[in-house]
């Protein structure tokens, strides 16, 4: 997380640390599912049990976490590895239900009405243990509040060199400051971009940390997130069938 | 031209059956003689027991020696047994401590703050069929679902 601050206990109780080939993140759904980015766990798709999933952690290097293990990995069938980031979404089924408490709580899925809390300039919050402006993985869970960026503006930002190959699709949303300095970064992948539903006073997942500029927090570039509301039927279908 | 002897006999009646408490007898007759039978039916919420063994039905037949072919059963109150545990929740006995018999009431509840009850209000009654049943007729216990989207950022620390 670039330009963020330290999270306090209970701030992001849905935050999941995923260790496999690299450091990634996810968000707890219900008490036995983790929502994450397809690119973050693609290498482990046939070896779910190799994923080391940690919940209730605030510090990346603390032994005080709740250990969970993957029973199965579900990568969106429309995701193609190393060919852009469209449909960059995945679900992990945990082998056991976790006990919910103030440090481990699931994130809500967006209601149909949630788009009214995710308009341009509405503030979302990204969190993770990814690279900070110091160029190192964060020891403490960090978070940053960032506004949603107009889709056309974001698409245009990634049409300029050297990003001319970067395709911002309708399945993505962008967030960040035009001036830069606040962003998610490598190691934050799979984590939730969350929004407060003002009617229910509950947080919901609007985006999944997916991709962005080569230099995190770069001015004129934005973080790109998987647009979760587009995938509610897919998520519900998998969770109800498995 | 010989003798003709006409025999007449009066059947030895069996002892008059007394229905067990919470049961009734059918058919009701003035007396029961050889080959007559009766059945015992228990009131709703009670079940037929012969000793400790449950019976689906009971019928006794009067034998030629004036005895019934089997002893009178009892009608014992239906016991639904201890209710299923509720993961992330608890069960409270409303009727009385550990009372699990017919018409007893229990109340399921979920752990406050972090879980909420799905399906029904959590109130179950021990019915005549021996099952704990909710007001909506469900026999399976409720489910405690995690509450989503809670954060110390909006609750000011928990």
């Amino acid at each position: 997380i670039y330009g963020g601050q330290k999270a306090k206990p209970g701030d992001f109780p849905w935050q999941v640390l995923i260790l496999g080939g690299s450091t990634a993140a996810g968000a707890l759904l219900y008490d036995n599912w983790v929502l994450t980015a397809a690119h973050a766990i693609y290498e482990q798709k046939h070896d779910a049990s190799s994923l080391d999933i940690r919940l209730g952690a605030l510090k990346r290097l603390s032994p005080h976490y709740t250990q969970a293990w993957a029973e199965a990995v579900f990568i969106h069938e429309g995701y193609t590895h190393d060919a852009g980031f469209d449909n960059d979404i995945a679900l992990i089924k945990l082998n056991n239900k976790v006990v919910i408490n103030s440090n481990i709580t699931p994130i809500c899925l967006p209601r149909k009405e949630a788009e009214s809390f995710m308009r341009t300039d509405d503030i979302g919050t990204a969190s993770g243990w990814g690279l900070t402006q110091r160029g190192l993985l964060a020891r403490n869970l960090m978070y940053v509040d960032i506004p949603i960026v107009d889709h056309q503006k974001c698409t245009a930002a990634y049409e300029k060199p050297p990003y001319s190959g970067g395709s911002v699709t309708a399945n993505m949303l962008c967030a960040g400051l035009e001036s830069g300095g606040k962003d998610s970064c490598r190691g934050d992948s799979g984590g939730a971009l969350v929004f407060l539903d003002n009617e229910t006073q509950r947080w919901f997942v609007g985006g999944i940390v997916s991709w962005g500029s080569m230099n995190c927090g770069e001015a004129g570039q934005y973080g790109v997130y998987t647009k979760v509301i587009n995938y509610i039927p897919w998520i519900k279908n998998i969770i109800s069938n498995f | 031209t010989g003798w003709k002897i006409h025999y007449t006999s009066t059947a030895q009646p069996c002892p008059y059956p007394m229905a067990p408490p919470n049961g009734h007898l059918s058919p009701v007759q003035a007396k029961y003689i050889l080959k007559d039978s009766f059945s015992i039916f228990c009131e709703p919420g009670y079940e037929l027991l012969q000793g400790h063994l449950p019976l689906k039905s009971f019928a006794a037949v009067c034998q030629k020696d004036g005895s019934w072919d089997q002893p009178m059963p009892s009608c014992s109150i239906v016991d639904c047994g201890p209710p299923d545990d509720l993961p992330s929740g608890r069960v409270e006995y409303i009727t009385g401590p550990e009372v699990t018999t017919y018409k007893a009431v229990i109340q399921y509840s979920c752990e406050e703050t972090f879980y909420t009850m799905k399906v029904n209000d959590g109130k179950y009654v021990c019915e005549a069929d021996g099952f704990w049943t909710s007001s909506k007729g469900e026999r399976s216990p409720p489910v405690c679902e995690p509450v989503c989207g809670l954060s110390a950022r909006t609750t000011g620390g928990r």
Epitope: D52, K59, L61, S62, P63, H64, Q67, W69, R139 | -
Partner: antibody, heavy 121, light 106 residues
Framework: QVQLVQSGAEVKKPGASVKVSCKAS????????MHWLRQAPGQGLEWIGD????????HYIEKFKDRATLTIDKSSSTAYMELSSLRSEDTAVYYC??????????????WGQGTLVTVSS | DIQLTQSPSSLSASVGDRVTITCSAS?????MYWYQQKPGKAPKLLIY???NLASGVPSRFSGSGSGTDNTLTISSLQPEDFATYYC?????????FGQGTKVEIK
């Protein structure tokens, strides 16, 4: 090389307190958690708790919550374990041990030599 | 708390013998750790994450297992291996140790 050197043996009276030190060298002290364990004579190992050397956050097992206090001094790369209201059953060898930071973070890759604490009237 | 039960509690063996120590957990654990302790000395890490050899530990030591049953094997016992061995888990809080297995010279 990586080393943890503990303070010497102590004899204490019941009701007293004892403070054991553990000086670390050969690694970045603040990168690791420091754990404290004990071993009563002829017995197995028992975990007391740990301290994060980067920010002094502590965790104790229930049994020691009220009597054990773990602290650190970053400037001297030293960890301390104080145990109060001593009783005879606290007689044991007390160990500091460094927490791993490579995999699960849940084991001890370097141990101090141990400090014998005897509680006797 | 997860209870760890080591068996045997003690064993007598000769140099060159293959020795197996088991550690049975009261509920499933993901990873097991093994330590060696000699009299008057601190424990020393042998095996981490069930089967990985700690730095500087001879290859005659190996760990295996899953779920509730884990094993430490010494393929060919050496004179310096006579010691007490402990298993440890932290799959569930709090971390716990086995009661130890003492390996003595026959």
């Amino acid at each position: 090389q990586v080393q943890l050197v503990q303070s010497g043996a102590e004899v204490k009276k019941p009701g007293a307190s004892v403070k054991v030190s553990c000086k670390a060298s050969g690694y970045t002290f603040t990168n690791h958690h420091m754990h404290w364990l004990r071993q009563a004579p002829g017995q197995g190992l028992e975990w007391i708790g740990d301290i994060d050397a980067s920010d002094s956050e502590t965790h104790y097992i229930e049994k020691f919550k009220d009597r054990a206090t773990l602290t650190i001094d970053k400037s001297s790369s030293t960890a301390y374990m104080e145990l109060s209201s001593l009783r005879s059953e606290d007689t044991a060898v007390y160990y500091c041990a460094r927490g791993d930071i490579t995999t699960t973070l849940r084991y001890f890759d370097v141990w101090g030599q141990g400090t014998l604490v005897t509680v006797s009237s | 708390d997860i209870q760890l039960t080591q068996s045997p509690s003690s064993l007598s063996a000769s140099v060159g013998d293959r020795v197996t120590i088991t550690c049975s957990a009261s509920s499933s654990v993901r990873y097991m750790y093994w330590y060696q302790q000699k009299p008057g000395k601190a424990p020393k890490l042998l095996i981490y994450d069930t089967s990985n050899l700690a730095s500087g530990v001879p290859s005659r030591f190996s760990g295996s297992g899953s779920g509730t049953d884990n094993t430490l094997t010494i393929s060919s016992l050496q004179p310096e291996d006579f010691a007490t061995y402990y298993c440890q888990q932290w799959s569930s809080y709090p971390l716990t140790f086995g009661q130890g297995t003492k390996v003595e010279i026959k």
